[in-house]
Interface confidence: low
């Protein structure tokens, strides 16, 4: 039965669509952005504890106008999905129930048989997400490729196709700076620098504080980072623009230890305000 | 590595204004000084090792009036820009750091009050 | 680690409406959605609602015309507001982290209502 | 909105033995359940999903099985640490909890 009037099985599962995607509520799923290629995903770790795979699973003839050559009923149709060793099968979603295929995976997690049917209709379409488990992904892992290949016991020739996304570690810094004040101004005497003694004969006093937060994991995990200023010291032909004094960096050294930043300030020596000191 | 400065190109030659006396509002001009065309940067460098949750950078500087008073007389107002960013060595090459720089302007005049004495 | 913690007025009138927060460490609001429970005394957990990572919103249809959930994600902060309390309302009120998977993995401690004139 | 009915409300047993909890939802869930262990003053916990998988650190004597409407929780080896309030909860649609079952050792 549902094997035309040759008695003939001939399927024609295909793998209709492939993504990677990610969840935005249990029945929302949004595709991830593609690279240039327009074949691999964009992933960016930055917390997600899991990523979606999309399929969307058809038997339906590959000629319409030749209905009885194929499409015939999949018996014992399945998908069956090997995961690479960054990624676990944690479950499988639909956005109706009613399709949702029974999948099962080994001790590991790492094998994923998914029922589609027995048999899968003439006609049929089932769309499904896979919820892949993302804790193995370690900032080594560059790549992400999930192997996906439709069986059948009805008569129908099945290559393994593969769904592929570059995997980035974005690290969650941001960074913010402000001067206090914001406005200056001068004023007072020409005098040379062999002369200058306390910062105080130099001119009108400004800060600056830049900030760096980090809203994701310890950074000592991702090699060395630093922050960076690039303070305008001179003027092209030389002359003093602005005069470093004091240098000092709060938090990134562990627990109560204050930062070391390169070169040193004040490399004239001048002598400190007392109201600084 | 991630978020390093762009090369410092020779900086560009601005004419120092020499002329300290005087001028008319309306012949004076706006002005900024920007690493690397229009200044010269230092680069102050502070690494971050066990970076959790926030750090802060203060800087404390002062203007050289001399130079403001023998170069920019002429000039109606002065932008200093101070930049700032994040840099990561890693062995890592898929790190992806975004909103990793900053900039901070400071408005420089001539003190409206100041008597100038060369 | 991750955390939640919620805190709120403690006693409200009904003719207020009820405010409680939920604040969170260890994890980031963009990532994860966050639910809201209550238990009345001597009484099993009742589901209020839910806020995804995204903002979406969805709620028990009971309460729905009652009920607003929203968030601050860079304060890292859920907000539960329910309008006309009345002493049905009165209960232990938790938020809970949405494991992804659709169970709530992690809880807060809870925080007690009274609703009194 | 999916019921679930939880039975017994309150059981008694002995330390060693072990018990079993039983809900029943008004419709399929798909295996989307989950179990709780609440003790008064504290936050519940989340000892199994996907109606059989054990959380991280949760001890094997915990277990769980069912499919379609009917799902059944287990505790063998029943130590005092146990005596809590435990719920399903089903995650399909929506969320609903069952009404909880009260353990106590005898």
């Known amino acids: 039965q549902g094997c035309g009037q040759d008695k003939i099985c001939q399927s024609n599962l295909q793998l209709e669509r492939y993504q990677f995607c990610s969840r935005i509520s249990d029945t929302e799923f949004q595709a991830l952005p593609m690279d240039l290629d327009g074949r691999t995903a964009l992933f960016a770790l930055s917390g997600q504890p899991f990523i979606g795979l999309e399929l969307t699973v058809t038997n339906l003839p590959s000629d319409p106008s030749r209905p009885q050559a194929d499409g015939d009923d999949a018996h014992e149709a399945q998908l069956l999905v090997t995961l690479p060793a960054s990624l676990r099968y944690s479950g499988v979603r639909a956005l109706d129930s009613v399709e949702k295929p029974l999948c099962l995976s080994n001790d590991s997690a790492s094998h994923v048989e998914c029922e589609l049917g027995n048999p899968m209709k003439r006609g049929a379409q089932v769309t499904f997400y896979l919820i892949l488990s993302t804790s193995g992904i370690t900032i080594e892992t560059t790549e992400l490729e999930v192997k996906l290949l439709l069986a059948t016991i009805s008569e129908q020739e099945l290559d393994p196709v593969s769904v592929r996304a570059h995997v980035f570690i974005e690290l969650p810094l941001s960074i913010s700076g402000v001067a206090t004040p914001q406005q200056l101004f001068f004023s007072g005497e020409v005098k040379g620098e062999s002369a200058m003694r306390s910062e105080r004969e130099l001119g009108r006093k400004v800060k600056y504080e830049v900030t760096v937060s980090n809203q994701g994991q310890s950074l000592n995990t991702l090699g060395s980072a630093n922050l960076n200023i690039m303070w305008p010291h001179e003027i092209a032909n030389g002359k003093w623009l602005l005069y470093p004094m004091r240098v000092e960096l709060e938090g990134g050294q562990g627990p109560g230890k204050r930062g070391i930043c390169s070169p040193r300030p004040n490399i004239l020596q001048l002598d400190v305000d007392s109201r600084d000191r | 590595e991630l978020g390093q400065p762009e090369p410092q190109e020779p900086p560009e030659k601005v004419e120092p204004s020499t002329s300290w006396w005087p001028v008319s509002s309306a012949e004076k001009r706006n002005m900024t000084l920007d690493c690397p065309r229009t200044a010269k940067c230092v680069v102050f460098s502070c690494p971050l090792y066990s970076f959790d949750r926030a750090a802060v950078l203060h800087v404390w500087g002062r203007l050289w009036n001399s130079t403001f008073l023998e170069e920019y007389m002429a000039v109606k107002s002065l932008e200093v820009i101070v930049r700032a960013n994040i840099t990561v060595k890693s062995s890592i090459k898929n790190l992806l750091l975004r909103d990793a720089s900053t900039v901070i302007p400071v408005m420089v005049y001539l003190d409206p009050m100041a008597v100038v004495v060369e | 680690q991750v955390q939640l913690k919620e805190s709120g007025p403690g006693l409200v009138a009904p003719s207020q409406s009820l405010s409680i927060t939920c604040t969170v460490s260890?994890?980031?609001?963009?990532?994860?959605?966050v639910h809201w429970v209550r238990q009345p005394p001597g009484k099993g957990l009742e589901w209020l609602g839910v806020?995804?990572?995204?903002?979406?919103?969805h709620y028990n249809s009971a309460l729905m015309s009652r009920l607003s959930i929203s968030k601050d994600n860079s304060k890292s902060q859920v907000f539960l507001k329910m309008n006309s309390p009345q002493t049905d309302d009165i209960a232990m009120y938790y938020c809970?982290?949405?494991?992804?998977?659709?169970?709530?993995?992690?809880w807060g401690a809870g925080t007690t209502v009274t609703v009194s004139s | 909105d999916i019921q679930m009915t939880q039975s017994p409300s309150s059981l008694s047993a002995s330390l060693g033995g072990k018990v079993t909890i039983t809900c029943k939802a008004s419709?399929?869930?798909?295996?989307?359940i989950a179990w709780y262990q609440h003790k008064p003053g504290k936050g519940p916990r989340l000892l199994i999903h996907?109606?059989?998988t054990l959380q991280p650190g949760i001890p094997s004597r915990f277990s769980g099985s069912g499919s379609g409407r009917d799902y059944s929780f287990s505790i063998s080896n029943l130590v005092p640490e146990d005596i809590a309030t435990y719920y399903c909860?089903?995650?399909?649609?929506?969320?609903?909890f069952g009404g909880g079952t009260k353990l106590e050792i005898k």
């Open positions: 809970a982290r949405d494991g992804y998977y659709g169970d709530f993995d992690v």
């Open positions: 260890g994890f980031s609001l963009t990532s994860y959605g």
């Open positions: 806020i995804w990572a995204g903002g979406i919103t």
């Open positions: 419709q399929d869930i798909n295996k989307y």
């Open positions: 996907y109606t059989s």
């Open positions: 909860l089903q995650y399909d649609n929506l969320r609903t």
